[in-house]
């Protein structure tokens, strides 16, 4: 009933009812991408598939240019998994060379951009030191939580190093949000 | 109101309203597994507790023979955590023996089976290389995301090695889904 | 409509409809902890920010004294991430000393307390061995699942070692729940 319900006039309507099926929702899946030059301490954003395979956007939740656009204000559950993989960890080389043993790391950040606000807001961060003994390593970072978002907010997923992202399968690296 | 709402006849009903309490939901918890022979490159499915302790199924969401049965079409949030544990990592032994340093791995896949479709669909995968230095290791892999499912779809959780799954506690290894 | 709907008297009302916007919800974020003495085998509970920054509680979901209070019975999705970090892993020191190589571990438990029930119930546990080669390590543990809760239940997050919890950023360590 598109967020409206007809009730007897004597009843106080505290909040509109709405059908669950018409709530904004999206599940985006990974596509291959190679990093462009990016500024130090500024993590690049991932680009996503939004309509093929398992990916979809619905009910005015749109995807454009690395961003999920929030079409209406409310509480959203937002989630992402990024699977990373690498050939070797420099950590072991640094260790052997006798230099300070500062491990490498992999990081995922789900970021909110509000046009009226100068700085992006980091909603969720998953960060992990990587100091693998093996020559080939791979591992996922999963994030998910609920946030109050405003119409017009934009969501993106940033990573510490795009070249380490496993883009080979749509079930390994993904990003989604839905209105509760 | 079981997905129906009575509204004045002049109103356009875009989508049925339905009470949240009658939506299909399940939370399944780990039980001790019987390792079965499985074909190479075909991960075995876990079976689950569906009614004791923290586990439940409700509103026509049924569990049978390792599968969660989807009773109605819609968007579902699906999740699982599998905790793995092992005594040693063969990785270190392989390394010491001078063989190629290919790390072992642990993998969880949430799979959808549709009877009318010949191949299962992998919805979610969490995969991690394991090359632990310690003689005893343990770690969880968590997955969760939203998918559009059809009535009659079946969901299962597959793992790379059933013998590494920690089945000792219902809070360590679990599987669930709920209609949004 | 606050859980009520007016329907023709001849209709069977199976379950009340209610507006999504008035459901109990909370997202809590990390604050600096004061390490407290705790009994052996009894993990300390974290306390949380509940109103500043990204944190909020709404619709009668209240936070008090390390607990989220459940204001109405129903099925809730509960989640938490705790990011741990440490300077060194004693594991390597233990190994070098020739003692049994039992790795250290980090553990998160989401616990339910019901006043009428003598023992807390562990709903979710994420536990991981830590045997890092690097001198500085950090990693998150994420948990999330659905549970049937009763009005008056209390939820808390317990960790194996408060001193290892990364409290520096609200996006790294958090705890939330919402009525489905």
């Amino acid at each position: 009933l598109k967020g409206q319900e007809f009730a007897p006039s004597h009843q106080q309507v505290y909040a509109p009812l709405r059908a669950d099926g018409d709530k904004p929702r999206a599940h985006l899946t990974v596509v291959r991408q190679t990093p462009t030059q990016h500024f130090k301490n500024q993590f690049p954003a991932l680009h996503w598939e939004h309509e093929l395979g398992l990916a979809f956007t619905k009910n005015r939740m749109n995807y454009t240019n690395k961003f999920l656009l929030i079409p209406e204000s409310g509480d959203y559950f937002i989630y992402s998994q990024v699977t990373f993989r690498g050939m070797t960890s420099e950590c072991s080389e640094i260790r052997q060379a006798g230099r300070p043993n500062k491990p490498d790391s992999i990081t995922v950040v789900i970021t909110k951009v509000t046009d009226s606000y100068p700085e992006p807001t980091q909603l969720l961060m998953g960060t992990k030191s990587v100091c693998e003994v093996g020559s080939n390593w791979f591992q996922p970072i999963y994030l998910g939580a609920m946030f109050s978002l405003q119409e017009g907010d934009k969501l993106m997923v940033n990573v510490s190093d795009i070249s380490l992202v496993d883009y080979t399968k749509e079930d390994k690296t993904f990003f989604g949000a839905f209105l509760l | 109101l079981k997905g129906q709402e009575f509204a004045p006849s002049h109103q356009q009903v875009y989508a049925p309203l339905r009470a949240d309490g009658d939506k299909p939901r399940a939370h399944l918890t780990v039980v001790r597994q019987t390792p079965t022979q499985h074909f190479k490159n075909q991960f075995p499915a876990l079976h689950w507790e569906h009614e004791l302790g923290l586990a439940f199924t409700k509103n026509r969401m049924n569990y049978t023979n390792k599968f969660l049965l989807i009773p109605e079409s819609g968007d579902y949030f699906i999740y699982s955590q599998v905790t793995f544990r092992g005594m040693t990592s063969e990785c270190s032994e392989i390394r010491q023996a001078g063989r190629p340093n290919k790390p072992d791995s642990i993998t969880v896949v949430i799979t959808k089976v549709t009877d009318s479709y010949p191949e299962p669909t992998q919805l979610l995968m969490g995969t991690k290389s394991v090359c632990e230095v310690g003689s005893n290791w343990f770690q969880p892999i968590y997955l969760g995301a939203m998918f559009s499912l059809q009535e009659g779809d079946k969901l299962m959780v597959n793992v790379s090695d059933i013998s590494l799954v920690d089945y000792t506690k219902e809070d360590k290894t679990f599987f669930g889904a709920f209609l949004l | 409509l606050k859980g009520q709907e007016f329907a023709p008297s001849h209709q069977q009302v199976y379950a009340p409809l209610r507006a999504d916007g008035d459901k109990p919800r909370a997202h809590l974020t990390v604050v600096r902890q004061t390490p407290t003495q705790h009994f052996k085998n009894q993990f300390p509970a974290l306390h949380w920010e509940h109103e500043l920054g990204l944190a909020f509680t709404k619709n009668r979901m209240n936070y008090t004294n390390k607990f989220l209070l459940i204001p109405e019975s129903g099925d809730y999705f509960i989640y938490s991430q705790v990011t741990f970090r440490g300077m060194t892993s004693e594991c390597s020191e233990i190994r070098q000393a020739g003692r049994p190589n039992k790795p250290d571990s980090i553990t998160v438990v989401i616990t339910k307390v019901t006043d009428s029930y003598p023992e807390p119930t562990q709903l979710l546990m994420g536990t991981k061995s830590v045997c890092e080669v690097g001198s500085n390590w950090f990693q998150p543990i994420y948990l999330g699942a659905m549970f049937s809760l009763q009005e008056g239940d209390k939820l808390m997050v317990n960790v194996s070692d408060i001193s290892l919890v990364d409290y520096t950023k609200e996006d790294k360590t958090f705890f939330g729940a919402f009525l489905l």
């Epitope: 596509v31 991408q33 190679t34 990093p35 050939m87 080979t168 | - | -």
Partner: antibody, heavy 119, light 108 residues
Framework: EVQLVESGGGLVKPGGSLRLSCAAF????????MNWVRQAPGKGLEWVGL??????????DYAAPVKGRFTISRDDSKNMLYLQMNSLKTEDTAVYYC??????????WGQGTLVTVSS | ENVLTQSPGTLSLSPGERATLSCRAS???????LVWYQKKPGQAPRLLIY???SRATGIPDRFSGSGSGTDFTLTISRLEPEDFAVYYC?????????FGQGTKLEIK
Amino acid sequence: EVQLVESGGGLVKPGGSLRLSCAAFGFTFSNVWMNWVRQAPGKGLEWVGLIKSKTDAGTTDYAAPVKGRFTISRDDSKNMLYLQMNSLKTEDTAVYYCTTDRGWGENYWGQGTLVTVSS
Amino acid sequence: ENVLTQSPGTLSLSPGERATLSCRASQIFSSSYLVWYQKKPGQAPRLLIYGASSRATGIPDRFSGSGSGTDFTLTISRLEPEDFAVYYCQQYGNSPYTFGQGTKLEIK
């Protein structure tokens, strides 16, 4: 600034061999898949083949007309891409371009090198 | 292989007019891997659009791309004299990568 510079083109007889090189500047070469593309005189663009990054096992893939005759390789330490062309045919006459293959994102091209196969 | 068919083969228009170029694929593929190039004699192809709709660096905003699945379009809203060239679409989602046969945009 991203730059790709091809070299090694020239005149060769049918059945002969030639090795093209492509020097890459201004980006992390080892992360990027690389393609060879060609354009025969008066014809359209034609994909020749690709080599993936080492992270993706460095595997190669080729268009049907050149499979078994052409080999793509790379030397990440020198930021160099190569195309070894054997058993050349007159229909291999074209301008050969090396290009980046970044997946989603901007791809870059060299200026091309002319290969003429003629007796 | 995924065959890309461009239409029309030749498009005769005057400066200031709007040009609409079509690219149709024989198989569905991700729009992330659809690009449009401009090619002039003696020059390397110039990337105009990547990901079906994202303008490459330095490309004027009169160039726009759209489409998904199997049908893609390049639009030049107001033709300038320097826009007359051959335009190619390419997919690189599935191997073998393929180009369309090209659309020649000529001055009327």
